[in-house]
């Protein structure tokens, strides 16, 4: 279930997945929520003088049992991911941090009159993930009223330091406030030849697009279908970027589908979940649990309710079916995507809906019933 | 549906076939079950045939060939065409059908969820259009229900493709840039559904397009979320207790 409580002066021991820098516990929790395996986090708001490099450290953790031993640590804040918290799941983060320098790669320095203008500049720049603004009282005159646009490989600061008269914050693209506009075109039989930032395995171009949207550095993508000639690249979704922020003209390529991240959409962005169930498709991955249920929808619901489950397979093979139902395999992987996708199985596969804003319910919000 | 595939029984249980019985009986439009006594469809389906008596509505079927004289059908008790719909314009292409007798819900015949007014800005990424319509522009009605997945196209983009028409906020467009997949003649009134948060929602009603599945000519659908007030008003005023709201 959904657990929103934060534990002050508490640190979870073990279960480490990744460590990043975040300006506060709320942002750390957000990062944990969107990480494919993170269930728990610990954030260091205050550290002893000897460990200043650990201050603002956000430690993302996993646990087979869903919990980890707690140790007392002054200045630490710990909590749970919001993976099953429906309406509380949002990538949008509007907070502004006074007196903090969120460091990263400075790729643009512009003069702006205020912090709002600076944040807007960041929101309207393809590459900007976070920014730092130097006020008119900053000790170095050449940086006063300057807006530094930044990015990093992880999308989060490479370090965070306290500094007077500096204000930092994040791009509001994920709040649907970017004015860049978002092309929703899907280019059939076309590939983009730009720089790959990552690759994942997906069943279709729409899942690929959603993954691109929520990846910190993906601006557009190319997906190769299962008919693609190179076997190792079948069902591979290449997440891409370019210096200009725009792709080079698409190259005609049979069995390739390309498109754009929807990060800069003005209207509500897609949810970070994939609800479609794929018939005759096998999502391979690490086995988490096996249950017997009646129907792929119920299997998906079971996966959604099992917090560590990322995707599932529902088998309809006679040997996999009993009186109480057929085999529902709950699975996971390091990146949340199947490790391999194969076709022709008797059954279906799909993803957990744990990051959907609304948990699945067959009931409509609005029902029309003449009684 | 152009560029689609055969659907399976019970896959789209809200889909109905609207047929006209004159000398013979023919499929003219699709529709969607939204309540035990309610079907939502396109107003233009009734142009020239606004007579409730000649219409027969079939739900829970996959193949039109399943329909015989013995196949149970629903009759129209009340036909509510949007009061602003004009034959000379393409706006307000929406109509409600109140059935004479309530439907029994089964695995193969049940309602589709309606969006809320708040869903007007939601971006849907898993959308499907279904129907028994033509599979090419100069085609014929299909026997087996067809389905096709199709991406939504922003209205500004759609307006650029249809310079001679007004694409307003009560419309929603869907299609691939290079064409190839689309609704077609006979699919009118049928559903454009999208799965969102694990739930299928009726996002559009098949309305019109320039030809079928042409390059740079998306399909245009009536945007259901923009008509929620109208739908609720009509279904409520027809029956004081017609509406039931459940929390999501």
């Amino acid at each position: 279930g959904c657990m929103t409580q934060l534990y002050k002066n508490t640190f979870f021991r073990g279960g480490d997945l990744a460590a990043i820098y975040t300006p506060d516990a709320q942002y750390c929790q957000k990062m944990c929520t969107f990480h494919p395996r993170c269930l728990l986090f610990s954030f260091l708001a205050v550290t002893p003088p000897k460990e200043t490099n650990k201050r603002f450290g956000c430690f993302m953790k996993e646990s087979i049992t869903g919990t980890l031993p707690r140790i007392h640590r002054t200045g630490a804040i710990s909590g749970h991911s919001l993976k099953q918290c429906g309406h509380q799941i949002s990538a949008c983060h509007r907070d502004i941090y006074k007196g903090l320098d969120m460091r990263g790669s400075n790729f643009n320095i512009s003069k702006t009159d205020n912090i709002e203008e600076c944040q807007k500049l960041c929101t309207n720049n393809f590459h900007c993930q976070f920014f730092t603004y130097a006020t008119s009282a900053f000790y170095r005159p050449e940086y006063r009223k300057k807006c530094l646009l930044k990015h990093s490989a992880s999308g989060t600061p490479t370090s965070i330091k306290s500094a007077d008269n500096l204000v930092s914050g994040f791009s509001l693209k994920s709040c649907a406030l970017s004015e860049i506009g978002c092309p929703m075109d899907i280019f059939q039989h076309s590939a983009f030849a730009d720089l790959n930032v990552s690759q994942v395995i997906t069943p279709d171009a729409f899942v690929c697009r959603t993954i691109c949207t929520f990846h910190p550095n993906c601006l557009f993508f190319t997906f190769y279908t299962n008919e693609w000639e190179t076997e190792s690249q079948r069902n591979v979704c290449f997440l891409k970027t370019s210096k200009s922020g725009r792709p080079s003209p698409p190259i005609p390529q049979e069995n390739a589908i390309s498109g754009y991240s929807l990060l800069t959409c003005r209207k509500t962005r897609p949810e970070p979940c994939h609800s479609k169930i794929y018939s005759g498709v096998d999502f391979e991955g690490e086995e988490l649990n096996v249950t017997f249920v009646q129907g792929a929808d119920v299997c998906q619901e079971t996966c959604t309710k099992t917090i560590r489950c990322q995707f599932f397979i529902y088998s309809l093979l006679p040997q996999d079916c009993k009186e109480e139902g057929c085999k529902c395999s709950l699975r996971l992987s390091t990146d949340g995507s199947p490790t391999r996708i194969t076709y022709g199985m008797q059954g279906s596969s799909g993803y957990s809906l744990r990051l959907c804003k609304l948990v699945d319910s067959p009931d409509c919000t609005t029902k029309i019933n003449a009684r | 549906i152009v560029g689609g595939t055969n659907a399976s029984l019970g896959e789209w249980p809200w889909q109905v076939s609207l047929q006209v019985k004159l000398v013979s009986q023919t499929h003219l439009c699709g529709g969607s079950i939204i309540g035990r006594q309610w079907v939502l469809t396109a107003a233009h389906c009734f142009d020239g045939i606004p007579y409730p008596d000649v219409w027969r509505i079939y739900g829970g079927i996959l193949s039109l060939s399943e329909i015989t004289k013995e196949t149970p059908s629903s009759r129209i008790k009340e036909l509510i065409i949007h009061q602003e719909y004009k034959v000379s314009e393409g706006n307000y292409d929406i109509a409600l059908i109140k059935l004479q007798t309530p439907l029994n819900y089964t695995e193969f015949q049940k309602p589709i969820c309606l969006p809320s007014k708040a869903d007007t800005n939601t971006i849907y990424t898993n959308c499907w259009v279904t129907g028994w319509g033509y599979t090419k522009e100069q085609g014929e009605t299909q026997n087996i229900l067809q389905k096709a997945t199709i991406p939504l196209v922003p209205n500004e983009e759609c307006q650029k493709k249809y310079r001679d028409y007004v694409i307003n906020k009560q419309m929603i467009c869907a299609g691939y840039k290079e064409g190839g997949t689309d609704a077609c003649k006979g699919d009118s009134g049928g559903p454009l559904v999208c799965k969102h948060s694990g739930r299928w929602q009726l996002v559009g009603i098949t309305s019109w397009g320039e030809g079928c599945a042409r390059k740079d000519q998306p399909g245009v659908y009536t945007k259901v979320s923009e008509y929620m007030d109208w739908i609720l008003e009509k279904t409520q005023s027809s029956d004081v207790r017609a509406l039931e709201t459940s929390s999501a």
Epitope: - | H44, D47, D93, G186, S188, W208
Partner: antibody
Framework: EVQLLESGGGLVQPGGSLRLSCAAS????????MTWVRQAPGKGLEWVSY????????IYADSVKGRFTISRDNSKNTLYLQMNSLRAEDTAVYYC??????????????????WGQGTLVTVSS | EIVLTQSPGTLSLSPGERATLSCRTS???????LAWYQQKPGQAPRLLIY???SRATGIPDRFSGSGSGTDFTLTISRLEPEDFAVYYC?????????FGQGTKVEIK
């Protein structure tokens, strides 16, 4: 009641200019494509030009391309036809018409459902 | 451009008779974009049929349209005195939009 009223016709010399107006009432002008059709004395109907509801898209018959300009002012519910470099063969009654574009069988329909009474343009020296 | 050829050029009939007017197009025309108009001397044309077969508002049911592809027909089942006029078919399937040359229905 839908009404279209043309004005601006008259006698003009070859090479001259004329601007026709069509005042529309009784319908939401900005929803409709509008068109001009002409009819030379004793001859059949000839389509001249049309303009999209917003005014952003215009199409012309080859016989008038480059010489005639169709425009509209949706705030004034008025359609215009600016005619330059007029020739004797442009002599005709000019009608403005509303283009109805309904929906039938999942396609749009297109037809001229209301016409003005016409205005005569005579090009002669 | 799509050329519309109407036949016959003139049709001489008596009131009460049936009139059949033909319109042939040089290329395929989607029937949604085929219309018929009636014009009397000194008057503006009047819409009779749109979408090849749908009667316009206020048009008596003795007028009917049919056809598809490249062959279209306007039928007046029983001619009334007020029906003697010139009839035009017109396509707006492709630009330039074009009219047929007209068929004159005159009293025999």
């Amino acid at each position: 009641e839908v009404q279209l009223l043309e004005s601006g016709g008259g006698l003009v010399q070859p090479g001259g200019s004329l601007r026709l107006s069509c005042a529309a009432s009784g319908f939401t002008f900005s929803h409709y494509l509008m068109t001009w059709v002409r009819q030379a004395p004793g001859k059949g109907l000839e389509w001249v030009s049309y303009i999209s509801p917003s005014g952003g898209h215009t199409i012309y018959a080859d016989s008038v391309k480059g010489r005639f300009t169709i425009s509209r002012d949706n705030s004034k519910n008025t359609l215009y036809l600016q005619m330059n470099s007029l020739r004797a063969e442009d002599t005709a009654v000019y009608y403005c018409a509303r283009v109805a574009r309904g929906i039938a069988a999942r396609s749009r329909t297109s037809y001229f459902d209301y016409w003005g009474q016409g205005t005569l343009v005579t090009v002669s020296s | 451009e799509i050329v519309l050829t109407q036949s016959p050029g003139t049709l001489s009939l008596s009131p009460g008779e049936r009139a059949t007017l033909s319109c042939r197009t040089s290329q395929f025309v989607n029937s949604n974009y085929l219309a018929w108009y009636q014009q009397k001397p000194g008057q503006a044309p009047r819409l009779l049929i749109y979408g090849a077969s749908s009667r316009a508002t206020g048009i008596p049911d003795r007028f009917s349209g049919s056809g598809s592809g490249t062959d279209f027909t306007l039928t007046i089942s029983r001619l009334e005195p007020e029906d003697f006029a010139v009839y035009y078919c017109q396509q707006s399937s492709r630009t330039p939009w074009t009219f047929g040359q007209g068929t004159k229905v005159e009293i025999k």
